[in-house]
Every structure is written in C-alpha cells, then in structure tokens.
C-alpha cells in the first residue's frame, strides 16, 4: 500500500477473476478510481472500476476471460494498482506484486442437491465451480448444517479433507426443516482464504413411521 | 476476442438526433471499456466518448460535451452513443471500440474495432 491507512486485498478465483478491495480512510468521494492489472509474462492488460460497497471501501472484479478459462499460472505474477483520478492525471494510491496461486478465494459450490434423505440422515452433494485442474484433488471442505432454533454461527463446523463433493448428514431429528451449507478451499498458496458460502439448501427428513398399537 | 457491430447511422439534419449501437460477441462484455472514434473524410481517426466496464465513469472529447452520451447495457452486450444538436462537422464514420485496458482505449493501435457506421448531417 501507498500509506498506512490504505489497504489493498485482492483475491484470485484460480481461472479467469481477480477480486480486489481497496479501502482508504478519509478516502476522496466522487472520484473514479480503477485497478490497473498488468502480468509479468502475458500480452494483456486489464482493468476494472472500483465501486464503494462502503462508505471508505471499494471493490472490483478484473475478468479475465471466460469463466472457465485458466488465465494465469503458478509463475505468473501480476502488478496490480489502485489508479485515481485527479483531475486530467491518474494518481497511484496502492500497488502489490500478486501472485495469483498464493491469494486464492474459488467460488462458492454450486448445485448443491439432496441425493437421499431418511428420518435421521442425509446425503448431499455438491459441485466446485470454475476451479483450475492445476489443484487435481487437493481441496478440502468444510460444512454446515442449521437446525432449528439456531443460528448459522452456532452451527458446528463439519472439516473434509480432501476433494469430496458429498456428505452424509447423521443424527438428524425426524421430520424436521434444516439448511445446509458448504465452502471450499485449496491446500495451496500462503494467503489462500475460504471461498463464500453456498446458497443454503433446504431439506427436511422424513417422519418416523407411526408404531403399531399393542 | 470480441467482436463489434455498429448500427443505427444515417442523415440527419443540423440540430436532429441519431442514437448509435455497438453489439458485442465473442467474449465476457464486461470485461471491455467501451469507446467511440469518428473518422472524417481526409482526417485521423479521433477518440468521442468511452465507459467503463461499470457504466459508472464516461469521458467525452471537448467538442462533443453536453450533445452526446454513451452507455452501456451489460445485459444486452451493447454500447450506444446518443448524439444530440448535431452539426455539419460531426459528419464521419463512427466506430465503436474495444479494450480490456481502460488506460489504453484512446490509443488507435491497441484497440479491438467494429467496421463502422456513416453519419451525414446536413446543414
């Protein structure tokens, strides 16, 4: 970063996104400010506008290509620079040398599906979106079921180590409405965070079968 | 790479009005800045009017400022430049271009081109 109170995070999704966040304090309002990405090793440039998503906070996504196309590697590295306008002049207010396959944040699963429920279990299944080859299986999750009367943060947290896009929720109460969610992660890079949270699923088990009359 | 189809020129009497359009295809819309250039007969190329991926920001050269808007519709893949109070020297080939780098949309050899669509107003 230019100055202490500024601070620059980006994110790469591992194919064809970089998402970046600046914020500044005291930070000048109505002014256009864009990030400028500028590989070490390819024959493009690309920009984005940064958008305030709070009052000292802004954020852009640089697309790169299709959502699915693998864009950068593990020896790239990619200046990126916070650029504000003022007046006819572009003024740099935060820059880093990033690399790409050491900031990583994928997308949240996606096509997340009951596969089969019963009275006290549930197997669910789900699909990693837009994730580069390059990682093969070394992924982990890690999972969350809401039950009734809690909240989210309450939920304990389930930890899959390794790429397993299914789970077998146990010990669930009979007939009762739950929520699930699911989040992923590589095992590669230093500053590699989870991705998002998946939309919650909603499911609901079945009743216990009625006991006969003695 | 994105490719780029101007529409909706033609001849217009000074003072009348023309909304130009640029459909884009072949690649992720939003990841271009946007910008229109004119050519006259026997004149360079010049920069009119660009947007960013947003839509937020636009700039406008000064002759054109106050009489034409561009936007952008990131749904529908198209830029359009509405052009207001024309005059006889707005007369030229309109084209719409494309870059991934908002920092180079205004230099001619960087920039991904549609062919162009003629404007003529008479006085």
């Known amino acids: 970063a230019v100055n202490g109170t500024s601070q620059f995070t980006c994110f790469y999704n591992s194919r064809a996104n970089i998402s970046c966040v600046w914020s500044q304090d005291g930070a000048l309002q109505d002014t256009s400010c864009q990030v400028h990405a500028w590989p070490d090793r390819r024959r493009w440039n690309q920009t984005c506008e940064l958008l305030p998503v709070s009052q000292a906070s802004w954020a852009c996504n640089l697309i790169l290509g299709a959502p699915d196309s693998q864009k950068l590697t593990t020896v790239d590295i990619v200046t990126l620079r916070v650029l504000c306008r003022e007046g006819v002049r572009w003024r740099v207010m935060a820059i880093q040398d990033f690399k790409p396959f050491e900031n990583l944040r994928l997308m949240a699963p996606i096509s997340l599906q009951v596969v089969h429920v019963e009275t006290h279990r549930c197997n669910i299944s789900w699909e990693i979106s837009q994730a580069s080859h390059y990682f093969e299986r070394h992924l982990e999750f890690e999972a969350r079921t809401l039950s009734p009367g809690h909240t989210w943060e309450e939920a304990p947290l389930l930890t899959l180590k390794q790429k397993q896009e299914w789970i077998c929720l146990e010990t669930l109460t009979p007939d009762t409405q739950y929520e699930f969610q699911v989040r992923v992660k590589p095992l590669q890079g230093e500053f590699t965070t989870w991705s998002p949270w998946s939309q919650p699923l909603a499911f609901r088990t079945k009743p216990a079968a009625l006991g006969k009359d003695t | 790479e994105v490719q780029l189809v101007e529409s909706g020129g033609g001849l217009v009497q000074a003072g009348g009005s023309l909304r130009l359009s640029c459909a884009a295809s072949?690649?992720?819309?939003?990841?271009?800045?946007m910008a229109w250039f004119r050519q006259a007969p026997g004149k360079e190329r010049e920069f009119v009017a660009s947007?960013?991926?947003?839509?937020?920001?636009?700039d406008y050269v000064d002759s054109v400022k106050g009489r034409f808007t561009v936007s952008r519709d990131n749904a529908k893949n198209t830029v359009y430049l509405q052009m207001n109070n024309l005059k006889p020297e707005d007369t030229a080939v309109y084209y719409c271009?494309?870059?991934?780098?908002?920092?180079?949309?205004?230099?001619?050899?960087?920039?991904?081109w549609g062919q162009g669509t003629q404007v003529t107003v008479s006085s």
């Open positions: 271009a494309a870059n991934t780098d908002y920092f180079q949309i205004k230099s001619l050899d960087r920039n991904t």
């Open positions: 072949g690649d992720v819309f939003v990841r271009y800045t």
């Open positions: 947007v960013t991926d947003s839509g937020r920001t636009t």
